[in-house]
């Protein structure tokens, strides 16, 4: 028998520095977690103690903090190289800055293979990107070899900016021939490493003949066997065992997100490459694990540029940006409109001639807007200003909801109106009219939404049975501020870009902004 240790991360999302327990900015260092310096300590400890160790990443290193905003992926290549990753799969967020924003900072600089079997380049890009990512790579490990085959969510064109010269194929259809190729090369131990979410990971384990282990990402799935060490609630045991169609037991793993845990899976193979046993658990990277001093020093060196960036002007406002709780928790506020407009703008994807865009709607809890921005400071808007407005380090995500769920959400928005509570929704691509004289749960008297399957966008009444795409904060997607119906009834959820980054990019693009209060949210006569 031959034993392999798989260490894995996924959805790190730019958390190079240690974070608080909820993966936001570290405040009390003695209680902070994760970060590449701490990760390196644990990885090195395991590499020294065990013979056959692979360190793998299942995608979405890009996007999530000011590190990515400033360094644009160079930080990912640098620190993943420093940690000596063995392979990485491309995630959807690796395309956030377009193909060039992937090629130059990451693909050309990474000293480890970057993989995806279901992304096929065409046209002029095919020769440009040739060899910079691979469908699979055979890794020598001790006296054996292990095949790693990559995959990426086929939804990437709707979630990011891969352009028109990359085709995202069905994962299972694309993976099978590559696994077959590995088999012809006499590689009998094969790991599928990818970024399509836990449901697809399980399908790959079930359907792709020859895959021995699946290491996934995208859905931020936390798996654990035994008593979990922090706040995350396990979605199942670690590893999650799938019985393949040809009768094999295939372990599937994922390690939550944000570098909070290091996935740790021990696999025992027989001489024919069959999995005999698999066991392990994610390792919580808490403060009991010291940060490696040399990596920490490097982090501090790279940090200097971030501090300078946060005070630079992004753009100007010529109007007061009203982000006060007195406005945003009671009525339409222009800061809410600005943020929603930025959220929609960030999700412009012309992937189908029938649609002007795949999504037109935005909702945003007023309680998430934490500060106004005064235009009387020469109109200057900085990252620092935006960090005061959006201090929680969240993301603006894409969900699919039925019209009936949206209606419930808007009822919840005003179910206890007047108490300055955070659930009051700011909107984009939506016209809502409330009648507060009616009883809670029946206060939405008009709800019109902007069409997407149209050449001239216009507002149509919401249809209860129709499925709509909506951009919203991850806080709402996870049922925050009492929006349990969103969490319970959403049909799809894809995590998006860092909130501040979305707004800062929009302001930089527009240069000068002047958002107005324009009648997106109305109250029917006599009730307000």
């Amino acid at each position: 028998a031959w034993e392999l240790t798989i260490l894995h991360t996924n959805d790190v999302h730019s958390r190079l520095e240690q974070t608080s327990e909820d993966s936001s900015k570290c405040v009390n260092a003695s209680r902070c977690m994760g970060g590449v310096a701490r990760l390196f300590t644990k990885v090195q400890q395991i590499r020294r103690a065990e013979p056959n160790v692979l360190l793998l990443d299942a995608g979405d290193q890009y996007q999530g903090t000011i590190w990515f905003t400033v360094y644009k992926g160079a930080e990912v290549a640098h620190f993943m190289n420093a940690l000596r990753y063995d392979a990485m799969a491309l995630g959807n967020h690796e395309f956030d800055n377009g193909v060039e924003g992937l090629i130059e900072p990451l693909l050309k600089e990474a000293k480890f293979p970057i993989l995806s079997a279901n992304i096929k380049a065409k046209g002029p890009l095919a020769s440009q990107i040739s060899g910079l990512y691979l469908p699979y790579k055979v890794l020598p490990v001790g006296d054996e070899v292990v095949g790693i085959v990559g995959y990426t969510s086929k939804e990437t064109p709707f979630l990011s900016n891969p352009g028109t010269n990359l085709v995202f194929e069905d994962e299972i259809t694309a993976l099978q021939p590559e696994v077959d190729k590995l088999k012809t090369l006499n590689v009998n131990k094969i790991i599928a490493l990818g970024h399509s979410g836990f449901e697809m990971d399980k399908l790959i384990a079930q359907k792709v003949r020859g895959v021995d282990v699946v290491v996934g990402g995208h859905s931020n799935t936390f798996l654990y066997t035994g008593n979990p060490p922090s706040k995350e609630v396990p979605a199942g045991k670690y590893p999650f065992i799938v019985t393949s169609d040809d009768g094999r037991k295939v372990p599937v793993v994922q390690a939550y997100a944000f570098g909070k845990y290091l996935g740790y899976l021990k696999i025992e193979f027989d001489e024919r490459g069959n999995v005999i046993s698999s066991h392990g658990n994610p390792i919580l990277l808490n403060s009991s694990i010291p940060e490696d001093p040399s990596i920490k020093a490097d982090i501090n060196k790279w940090r200097i540029k971030l501090d300078n960036y946060s005070t630079q002007e992004l753009g100007k406002t010529i109007v007061y940006l009203d982000g006060s709780s007195q406005s945003c928790r009671f009525r339409e506020c222009n800061m809410g409109n600005l943020i929603c407009d930025a959220m929609i703008n960030n999700n412009l994807r012309h992937t189908d001639e029938m649609f002007w865009n795949h999504v037109s709607m935005c909702i945003l809890n007023g309680g998430g807007i934490r500060s106004p921005i005064d235009e009387r400071n020469n109109g200057t808007i900085t990252w620092e200003n935006l960090a005061a407005v959006l201090p929680f380090g969240g993301t603006f995500d894409l969900v699919q909801l039925k019209g009936s769920t949206l209606k419930k959400a808007f009822e919840h928005s005003v179910h206890r109106y007047g108490q300055s509570t955070g659930e009051f929704l700011q909107v984009g691509g939506i016209h809502v009219v409330y009648d507060l004289s009616r009883k809670p749960g029946d206060r939405v008297v008009k709800l019109d939404v902007l069409c997407t399957k149209c050449r001239v966008p216009s507002y149509d009444p919401l249809k209860m049975d129709e499925v709509y795409k909506v951009i919203l904060p991850n806080f709402l997607a996870n049922g925050g501020d009492g929006f349990q119906m969103i969490k319970d009834e959403l049909l799809r959820h894809d995590s998006g870009d860092q909130d501040i980054n979305v707004v800062s990019t929009y302001i930089s693009k527009m240069k000068v902004i002047y958002p107005a209060v324009e009648g997106r949210i109305k109250f029917s006569t006599g009730s307000h």
Partner: antibody, heavy 122, light 110 residues
């Protein structure tokens, strides 16, 4: 400036041993994989052996397996090739080369030493 | 004998475009990236192309690489007398668990 200074070549009888050294400077030696490549007189290049950044993984051409050992001393920035049971067909110029990467199997040889001649003859 | 083959010689006149081919198998070129090295007479080899088609800084854009399936090629346009050298392709081989060099091509500028 990257420099790879080689030493240890010479004339040796078949069956005997020789150790080649390659002193590296101008880069962080411990961050990169290293290789030995040889070239017999009038012939093409033949990769001989490679070693990962920390010495944890070593790779050999079939023609030298069991006879040659690649090693490194990261504290002294030096790469070695211990050649035992030498044969006439091992006669070649031996080049030390720096890998662009750390693993030894993924990357390219971006800097080369000038080479040292090893002649195996009775 | 080498598992990666190249034509032993190639030639062209100054200003011409020449192409050197490199043929391997699924375990080397088919699965891994290709690098090209130039060896001028009496000197050590020098990296010319890496990752199929990437040029290190200092290498003129007259040199370009490409890969398709289990074959690769090096193209030199606007041939110059100083391009007269031996050219080698190379790739990692997954079956041999080692690096393999092509047989080499001697380029003569007529």
């Amino acid at each position: 400036e990257v420099q790879l200074v080689q030493s240890g070549g010479g004339v040796v009888q078949p069956g005997r041993s020789l150790r080649l050294s390659c002193a590296a400077s101008g880069f962080r030696f411990s961050d990169f994989a290293m290789h030995w490549v040889r070239q017999a007189p009038g012939k093409g290049l033949e990769w001989v052996a490679g070693i990962s950044y920390d010495g944890g993984n070593k790779y050999y051409a079939d023609s030298v397996k069991g006879r040659f050992t690649i090693s490194r001393d990261n504290s002294n920035n030096t790469l070695y090739l211990q050649m035992n049971s030498l044969r006439a067909e091992d006669t070649a110029v031996y080049y030390c080369a720096k890998d662009h990467g750390y693993s030894g199997y993924y990357g390219h040889l971006d800097y080369w030493g000038r080479g040292t001649l090893v002649t195996v003859s009775s | 004998q080498s598992v990666v083959t190249q034509p032993p010689s190639a030639s062209g006149t100054p200003g011409q475009r020449v192409t050197i081919s490199c043929s391997g198998s699924s375990s080397n070129i088919g699965s891994n990236t290709v690098n090209w090295y130039q060896q001028l007479p009496g000197t050590a080899p020098k990296l010319l192309i890496y990752s199929n088609n990437q040029r290190p800084s200092g290498v003129p854009d007259r040199f370009s690489g490409s890969k398709s399936g289990t074959s690769a090629s090096l193209a030199i346009s606007g041939l110059q007398s100083e391009d007269e050298a031996d050219y080698y392709c190379a790739a990692w081989d997954d079956s041999l668990n080692g690096r393999v060099f092509g047989t080499g091509t001697k380029l003569t500028v007529l």
